[in-house]
């Protein structure tokens, strides 16, 4: 039988490549059974992750997965770095791996690269 | 259960362009990491690179120096590699593999492909 | 790049003898969210390898109990608690913690 734990699914190392001034979504896969968690994101500072108050976030319910979503509106050059969501479920937290935003400044940036570029290149956008 | 199959030429001629496919079954690639080792004759492994299926994103080792491009179709559950610019030395047996990339709870290898680089 | 050494990388052992493969790593494996992405492959004469332990210590399904891995940081060993013909190939070590992965040279287990 299907295990009724709470699980986050965020991959390990995972990275996006974002602009300034774009809109974003950053999602949270939560898999639950029968009572949705409180869910809350936090961002990494060196090893403690600081918790994000008055953003604004949002459920999605899809058939087998509710995704918990930061909203970015929009992105700006201080939203670079790693994000992890957690979930309180039955006074446990469980934690998902971090993702990271690359947070490209178009201002600094002499055009504007493609998604390829990025993705194959992701220390291109470290600024 | 989760298998691998790569496809391929197994001659490219120097100053060409290797082009490898891998498909998967028994899993969703969107669910995990897709990733390329390779092993020259009598020699160890090498780690080319990875991609994430879900969103395209990669890493590369940089030895490759920009020759390496790895994608995926996640319509066709499949991944590539193309090597540019190849020479005798990278005659190896290729191989792709798969790992869950949430939990590490799989990562399995498909079978490998000799490719041999020869005019 | 972080470098991947394995001893011995030749290992002559008798049927039903215990093997043990150390493993070191040039920079400590501890990730971030306090877990240690080391593995360890076994690679048969003419086959593709297959990942035998993960996370240090863990071991995949269908794997026998006679293998064990364990250590920290920098420090790894693979033991097979009595080798059995199957065994006989070569094993490496890999880590899964910094970019880009890297390998160990590989430790070539056959019969004494």
């Known amino acids: 039988k299907e295990s009724c734990d709470v699980q986050l699914y965020i991959k390990r190392q995972s990275y996006h490549s974002i602009f300034a001034g774009d809109p974003f979504k950053l999602e949270c896969p939560v898999k639950y059974c029968a009572h949705r968690p409180q869910v809350t994101w936090c961002k990494l500072n060196g090893t403690t992750c600081v918790k994000l108050e008055g953003r604004h976030t949002s459920w999605k319910q899809e058939k087998n997965l509710s995704f918990f979503i930061l909203h970015f509106e929009p992105v700006l050059p201080s939203d670079n770095g790693s994000y992890r969501c957690s979930a309180n479920f039955l006074s446990a937290i469980i934690e998902s791996h971090s993702t990271t935003l690359y947070v490209t400044d178009v201002k600094s940036a002499s055009e504007r690269p493609s998604k390829d570029e990025m993705a194959s290149r992701p220390w291109l956008l470290y600024s | 259960q989760v298998q691998l199959q790569e496809s391929g030429p197994g001659l490219v001629k120097p100053s060409g362009t290797l082009s490898l496919t891998c498909a998967a079954s028994?899993?969703?690639?969107?669910?995990?990491?897709m990733y390329w080792v390779r092993q020259p004759p009598g020699k160890g492994l090498e780690w080319i690179g990875r991609?994430?299926?879900?969103?395209?994103?990669?890493r590369y080792n940089p030895s490759f120096k920009s020759r390496a491009t790895i994608s995926a179709d996640k319509s066709k559950n499949q991944a590539s590699l193309k090597l540019s610019s190849v020479t005798a030395a990278d005659t190896a047996v290729y191989y792709c593999a798969v790992y869950d990339g949430y939990y590490e709870s799989f990562d399995v290898w498909g079978q490998g492909t000799l490719v041999t680089v020869s005019s | 790049d972080v470098v991947m050494t394995q001893s011995p990388l030749s290992l002559p052992v008798t049927l039903g003898q215990p093997a043990s493969i150390s493993c070191r790593s040039s920079q400590s494996l501890l990730d971030s969210d306090g877990k240690t992405y080391l593995n360890w492959l076994q690679q048969r004469p003419g086959q593709s390898p297959r990942r035998l332990i993960y996370l240090v210590s863990k071991r995949d399904s269908g794997v026998p109990d006679r293998f064990s891995g364990s250590g920290s940081g920098t420090d790894f060993t693979l033991k097979i608690s009595r080798v059995e013909a199957e065994d006989l190939g070569v094993y490496y070590c890999w880590q899964g913690t910094l970019f880009p992965r890297t390998f160990g040279q590989g430790t070539k287990l056959e019969i004494k």
């Open positions: 991609i994430d299926p879900a969103n395209g994103y990669t």
């Open positions: 028994g899993v969703n690639i969107k669910d995990t990491y």
